[in-house]
């Protein structure tokens, strides 16, 4: 299996961004997707049976979806950094994808939405 991600993306301070990963080339069943920041802190979990769990610190600015992705809102400069999606699958095990988000002060911040393999 292969994880495809939105790769390196940039977005405007105060704006929002979609973090998206996609697992391909496997028939494995996705049981859970975990979203984490570079410092090991959790953003959210999407469990196949139980739905979404949003980490308390992000409840007011993380929106579940689209799909297994995550929308991060009201961006601050502190949101710049690495984000990881971890796909828990059966029977393959875990797959991990990386996204780098740069939050820009500039009002002309370009949001790249292309998918790329990290």
């Amino acid at each position: 299996g292969t994880i495809e991600t939105t790769g390196n993306i940039s977005a405007k301070k105060g704006g929002s961004v979609i973090l998206q990963c996609h697992l391909s080339s496997t028939m494995a069943q996705v049981t859970q997707v975990n979203w984490e920041q570079h410092d090991h802190s959790l953003l959210a979990i999407r469990n196949a049976e139980l739905g979404w769990h949003i980490y308390p610190a992000f409840k007011d600015r993380v929106a579940p979806g689209p799909g297994l992705g995550l929308t991060l809102q009201s961006l601050t400069m502190n949101d710049t950094g690495e984000y990881f999606c971890t796909y828990h699958t059966y029977p393959d095990g875990t797959y991990r994808g990386r996204i780098f988000l740069e939050v820009l002060e500039s009002s002309v911040a370009e949001h790249s939405a292309r998918f790329q393999i990290p």
């Epitope: 049981t31 859970q32 975990n34 090991h40 802190s41 959790l42 979990i45 049976e49 139980l50 979404w52």
Partner: antibody
Amino acid sequence: DVQLQESGPGLVKPSQSLSLTCTVTGYSITSDYAWNWIRQFPGNKLEWMGYISNSGSASYNPSLKSRISITRDTSKNQFFLQLNSVTTEDTATYYCATLIYYDYGGAMNFWGQGTSVTVSS
Amino acid sequence: DIVMTQSHKFMSTSVGDRVSITCKASQGVSTTVAWYQQKPGQSPKLLIYSASYRYTGVPDRFTGSGSGTDFTFTISSVQSEDLAVYYCQHYYSTPWTFGGGTKLEIK
């Protein structure tokens, strides 16, 4: 508040099936909680056995997967544990517990008082 | 499976003392850790979820911290009613697992 009450036989013979019931009051099991079984062995070790979601889908601890079944009866607001081919190693106190996944993840915030099950011939 | 290790089976403390209980995960579990208190003859009671958030009604002398693999549960000023066994649990992925417990004894 949600209240949970376990019931079932306190003594089961080896190779037989263990069947327990958790009766829930104060909340519908079809609402947004997940409904778990946990057991505590002599010596206090805790083991998560599995859950059934509000939609009725179940997830089990792989160590028990071939022997365990968690089902429910929505009309009675009850959910059930069945553990097949028991041995003396299954002697434990069995708890049912619930959680609100969106808010607390897998942290279980309401527990029953537990029921003791001994496996012996 | 992820193994949660509480290295101290027993800890002895006095009323008014500060005490910290540690829990180590065999692999990173982000901040998906809960702490429970189990008093003699009772079922476990949730104290902390998401590593550092106090559950409703839990006194503020109880705190949790940590991320990744190392977690700490602290009682800032131990009271006699805190005599109990304390367990950590992760919910990073199933199967969710518990630590072996730390029994807090009051001198």
